[in-house]
Amino acid sequence: GSERTCCPVNWVEHERSCYWFSRSGKAWADADNYCRLEDAHLVVVTSWEEQKFVQHHIGPVNTWMGLHDQNGPWKWVDGTDYETGFKNWRPEQPDDWYGHGLGGGEDCAHFTDDGRWNDDVCQRPYRWVCETELDKASQEPPLL
């Protein structure tokens, strides 16, 4: 396949990535699947600059990102290293809070209304952001 040179319609370009901002909500797994079907992934935040960009577009609304600890350690969906990477948790988060009646632990990360991150029950129907890299080879065959 050929490399993408511009973002799909209704996606926003920023720093060689394309972003799509939902206007409805889905559980984390459904949001993750939606992005994959678009040949993308839930947003992976790698810098303060990218954090500010995403925050500007989502506003003060709880929004899923591509970070979870459903299998133990925190992991970014694209394989970006969590331990050495950018983090922007709210104070005392993540707490993987189990002491509630909300169906197990809090295994999925989201942007809160002030942009900082919190871990929450993955079933909540939050909005979400998909991201895909412009340099990634597209699935479309090259034009002859």
Epitope: S24, G25, K26, N62, R90, Q93, D95, W97, G99, H100, G101, L102, G103, G104, E106, T112, D113, N118, D120, V121, Q123, P125, Y126
Partner: antibody, heavy 126, light 107 residues
């Protein structure tokens, strides 16, 4: 037993604000959501939003965005809903309801509002 | 927002009757739907979650079915204490939305 007890009836003038309280007992307050739902006389139920005292998260229905604020005092196990710029259409009974995700074996999670307050009547009249 | 509609808006029935109430969603909500019962002057009470799962303590004459956009609440044999208003609630997306309600009264 688990219960939510709400503050008493209020009469307010248009343009004013009202703050309704909801005191939880019989369970760990920070372990569940609190939802706020209202019902005008003879009308249906209208979901206003939710808050979670553990995470600090809140979510408001767009219709009330900018006019509603949901807060809580953990030490008092009490949730509050404040509605500002009141108009006559805000005359209603306001309910708080405990919410959580219930697990059905093999079927995922489903949200339930299992315990409700007795309701607080708010009348807006000049 | 997801719109919920209910039919009928009211119905008259006798004790022992089989009663069916329908709730429709404006888009696919899978089975993210609950049914609530409300009596005059009282707070709502949960009956069914996940479209078909009976809450503990709720009599077995109540049942729910459906998924996607169409859902049904059935009372197999109406009892005197069942005369009330019934609401559906979707929790598939924020804002959660209730149906307008179905009032069941005595014929």
């Amino acid at each position: 037993q688990v219960q939510l007890v709400q503050s008493g009836a209020e009469v307010k003038k248009p343009g004013a604000s009202v703050k309704v309280s909801c005191k939880a007992s019989g369970y760990t307050f920070t372990s569940y959501d609190i939802n706020w739902v209202r019902q005008a006389t003879g009308q249906g139920l209208e979901w206003m939003g939710w808050m979670n005292p553990n995470s600090g998260n809140t979510g408001y229905a767009q219709k009330f965005q900018g006019r509603v604020t949901m807060t809580w005092n953990t030490s008092k196990s009490t949730a509050y809903m404040e509605l500002s710029s009141l108009r006559s259409e805000d005359t209603a009974v306001y309910y708080c309801a405990r919410g959580f995700y219930d697990t059905l074996t093999g079927s995922g999670y489903y949200y339930v509002m299992d315990v409700w307050g007795q309701g607080t009547t708010v009348t807006v009249s000049s | 927002d997801i719109q919920m509609t209910q039919s009928p808006s009211s119905l008259s029935a006798s004790v022992g009757d089989r009663v069916t109430i329908t709730c429709r969603a404006s888009q696919d909500i899978r089975n993210d739907l609950g049914w609530y019962q409300q009596k005059p002057g009282k707070a709502p009470k949960r009956l069914i979650c996940a479209a078909s799962s009976l809450q503990s303590g709720v009599p077995s004459r109540f049942s729910g079915s459906g998924s996607g956009t169409e859902f049904t609440l059935t009372i197999s044999s109406l009892q005197p204490e069942d005369f009330a208003t019934y609401f559906c609630l979707q929790h598939n997306d924020y804002p959660f939305t209730f149906g307008p309600g179905t009032k069941v009264d005595i014929k």
